[in-house]
Interface confidence: low
């Protein structure tokens, strides 16, 4: 009878102790161990038969009486050198070896192109023992081959630190062709030619190619693997594939699109993010890039006063991210302002056109001309001053800031005056005598309060001094006007 | 324009099997793949297989192979995707999208999504 | 199979805020098969990045993303409330296509 035993964590004695009676000799198994799981040695025997004493370390059997027949060398027997068979068939293969009981610590393992196969394969080693060897068949099947199981199979005894090997199995597993290489997708120039490769393997070899070109075959005849198919160029999108061919079938590769590269859709929601008084942030979507990278866009800017003359400001700027700030523009403008997209073919068509308005922002200059001078009678400065130019207010004028510094004796204060927009004069209390007074003016719109003029000085003297003539802005150059009595 | 209208609401019983659909309109149907993408509850995205409408060919994750069968009717424009011997850990949203190859590979259009329940 | 790893897996954040997310490859994927998806509560995904810096059609310009090689970011310019979602990246280079385990941008 067979009897299995499941592979442990230790090897485990062929003969656990003496064997009672005689050997068999029928040839019936007496040990089979399958190999399912983690590799365990395939064979591990201790024979302590009586009268047979062991002998050390051989390798090659000697002579050891006169009674004793000459032992022949340890060997594999020849076996199937080659099996041929398709995918997901079964296969079952061996190696037999005779070795003597003299033999220790035995072991067999199967290895696959140079690498020990350790696991997860369905090995058994079965032994038929006799009064002077032990003749042990290993077996290693595959329920269902895949490709990944060609190759070259071999057994490895070791006995008493000595390694006998077999002579190689070589399996080889037949199946559709193969890709190791397939088509792949490009964009490409109109009317340019390119190239596109594909290549699969067998077995069986030879593997022949056809290429599809929208569903129908280019090539008439097949040509060997690897092929490469030079397209001479092509003019709308195309879907190419490669049949793989074999005496198993056909294999297809998966289609790729050879996209032309067009100029790019032209860019969609161009929209305002932010709006100074000088200056619009605006981002938008690109459109299709036409299968080739944007290269950079273009933002055109005119200005929608029908009064204008028509003239279009071009800023360029990078393609990424998608957003730009156009900058010098005027305050209280509106404006039409359209994106445009390049790619290495041509500009995109410019978006739709949309308005955009700068705000008001704080005027650019300050009035203008600024006098001040002394009415002693009314104990009064009088402020006299123009107007900045309308273009500069940048925005609607909502009156003017006076800032006027007494000092006298180190005493220094500021006060601040808001006049309204109507005016072009103001009068201010004298705050301190025997002081200069400072008087600077800034316009003032929605947007902000502008820039202050330069200082204008005037000496307010003590009670009772002479009138004086008025002090005012100065020339440009003069850094420091004063009144001059 | 582009949509993926995806079957309704499936529960069935753990052992069973399910078939998903997915309807294509408003594009060359033949041209883009088709990928079925799982989502578990509170879960992550996990990418099933693709079906090449052109040719039929299938490309799965090792994952749910034996587990996911994908398959097409082009004369309706819709793929399917079955699955097999349900267990609880199918429970999922399966989606559908449109896969967008140009020297690249990601996924530009998806379904609304199938609920697929397997309780007892 | 190449492994997506992002982070962080959760965060909270203001409307106004910056808000960087990354990704990082467990092997080299060139740029063009790196792409990122947004999907908000009981939706599906949606293309938001794809080719690592390119705005899918519809996707606001506060949205931009970098990288190249093993590590991607996603980058929120203000964040909104209308972001609140769950952030994945994708990489389109090797079958199986996978997907970092996402990142869910919540509202503080």
């Known amino acids: 009878a067979i009897t299995e035993a499941r592979e442990e964590a230790k090897p485990y004695p062929l003969f656990p102790g003496p064997f009672p009676g005689s050997l068999q000799t029928d040839h019936t198994p007496l040990l089979s161990l399958p190999h399912a799981s983690g590799y365990q040695p395939a064979l591990m025997f201790s024979p302590t038969q009586p009268g047979r004493p062991h002998t050390g370390n051989v390798a090659i059997p000697q002579v050891t009486s006169v009674e004793s027949k000459p032992l022949p060398p340890l060997a594999f027997k020849h076996t199937v050198g080659h099996i041929i068979l398709s995918e997901h068939k079964g296969v079952k293969f061996n190696c037999s070896i005779s070795v003597p009981n003299i033999y220790q610590d035995t072991t067999i393992s199967w290895w696959k192109d140079g690498k020990e196969l350790l696991g997860a394969h369905h090995a058994i080693t079965q032994f038929y023992p006799d009064d002077e060897v032990t003749a042990i068949i290993a077996s290693f099947s595959i329920t269902s081959v895949q490709r990944s199981d060609n190759g070259s199979y071999i057994c490895k005894m070791k006995i008493n630190n000595e390694e006998i090997v077999s002579d190689p199995i070589y399996i080889e597993v037949q199946g559709l062709p193969h890709f190791t290489k397939q088509p792949e997708s490009m964009n490409v120039t109109r009317n340019t030619a390119f190239n596109l490769t594909c290549q699969a393997v067998g077995p069986p070899e030879p593997v022949n190619i056809f290429w599809v070109q929208n569903s129908s075959r280019v090539n008439e005849q097949p040509e060997k693997s690897p092929s490469v198919l030079t397209v001479p160029g092509l003019t709308e999108m195309a879907v190419f594939s490669c049949e793989a061919h074999n005496d198993k079938g056909l294999t297809v590769s998966k289609g790729v699109q050879i996209n032309i590269k067009a100029i790019p859709s032209p860019p969609t929601e161009v929209s305002i993010r932010n709006s100074t008084a000088h200056s619009i942030l605006i981002s938008w979507v690109p459109g299709f890039d036409g299968y080739s990278p944007f290269r950079n866009c273009s933002i055109q800017v005119k200005e929608a006063d029908p009064l204008s003359n028509g003239s279009v400001m071009i800023f360029n700027t990078s393609a990424l991210p998608h957003l730009y700030q156009i900058k010098q523009l005027q305050a209280l403008a509106n404006y039409s302002i359209g994106v445009s997209c390049m790619n290495e073919i041509g500009w995109s068509a410019v978006s739709p056109w949309i308005l955009a308005s700068t705000t008001e922002g704080a005027p650019s200059v300050a009035p203008l001309n600024v006098t001040v001078f002394l009415n002693e009678s009314s104990d009064n400065v009088d402020i006299r001053w123009m107007k900045p130019p309308t273009k500069q207010q940048d925005g609607e004028l909502v009156g003017y800031r006076i800032s006027h510094v007494w000092q006298s004796a180190g005493i220094s204060k500021e006060l601040l005056e808001e006049v309204g927009q109507n005016g072009s004069r103001a009068r201010i209390s004298v705050q301190v005598h025997n002081a200069t007074c400072t008087v600077r003016i800034a316009a003032v719109t929605r947007g902000g309060v502008g820039p202050f003029s330069d200082p204008v000085k005037i000496f307010i003297p003590a009670h009772g001094w002479v009138d004086y003539a008025p002090s005012s802005t100065p020339a440009p150059g003069n850094a420091d006007p004063v009144l001059i009595i | 324009q582009v949509q993926l209208q995806q079957s309704g609401p499936e529960l069935v019983k753990p052992g069973a099997s399910v078939k998903l659909s997915c309807k294509a309109s408003g594009y060359s149907f033949t041209t883009y793949d088709i990928n079925w993408v799982k989502q578990r509850p509170g879960q992550g995205l996990e990418w099933i297989g693709w079906?090449?409408?052109?040719?039929?060919?299938?490309k799965y994750n090792e994952k749910f192979k034996g587990k996911a069968t994908l398959t097409l009717d082009t004369s309706s424009n819709t793929a399917y995707m079955g699955l097999h011997s349900l267990t609880s850990e199918d429970s999922a949203v399966y989606f559908c999208?449109?896969?967008?190859?140009?020297?690249?590979?990601?996924?530009?259009?998806w379904g609304q999504g199938t609920t697929l329940t397997v309780s007892s | 199979e190449i492994v997506l790893t992002q982070s962080p897996t959760t965060m909270a954040a203001s409307p106004g805020e910056k808000i960087t997310i990354t990704c990082s490859a467990s092997s080299s994927v060139s740029s063009n098969y790196l792409h990122w998806y947004q999907q908000k509560p009981g939706f599906s995904p949606k293309l938001l990045i794809y080719?690592?810096?390119n705005l899918a059609s519809g996707v606001p310009a506060r949205f931009s993303g970098s990288g190249s090689g093993t590590s991607y970011s996603l980058t929120i310019g203000t964040m909104e409330a209308e972001d609140v979602a769950t952030y994945y990246c994708?990489?389109?280079?090797?079958?199986?296509?996978?997907f970092g385990a996402g990142t869910k941008l919540e509202l503080k």
């Open positions: 994708q990489q389109g280079r090797i079958v199986p296509l996978t």
């Open positions: 999208a449109r896969g967008y190859y140009d020297n690249l590979y990601y996924f530009d259009y």
């Open positions: 079906i090449y409408p052109r040719d039929g060919s299938t």
């Open positions: 080719r690592t810096s």
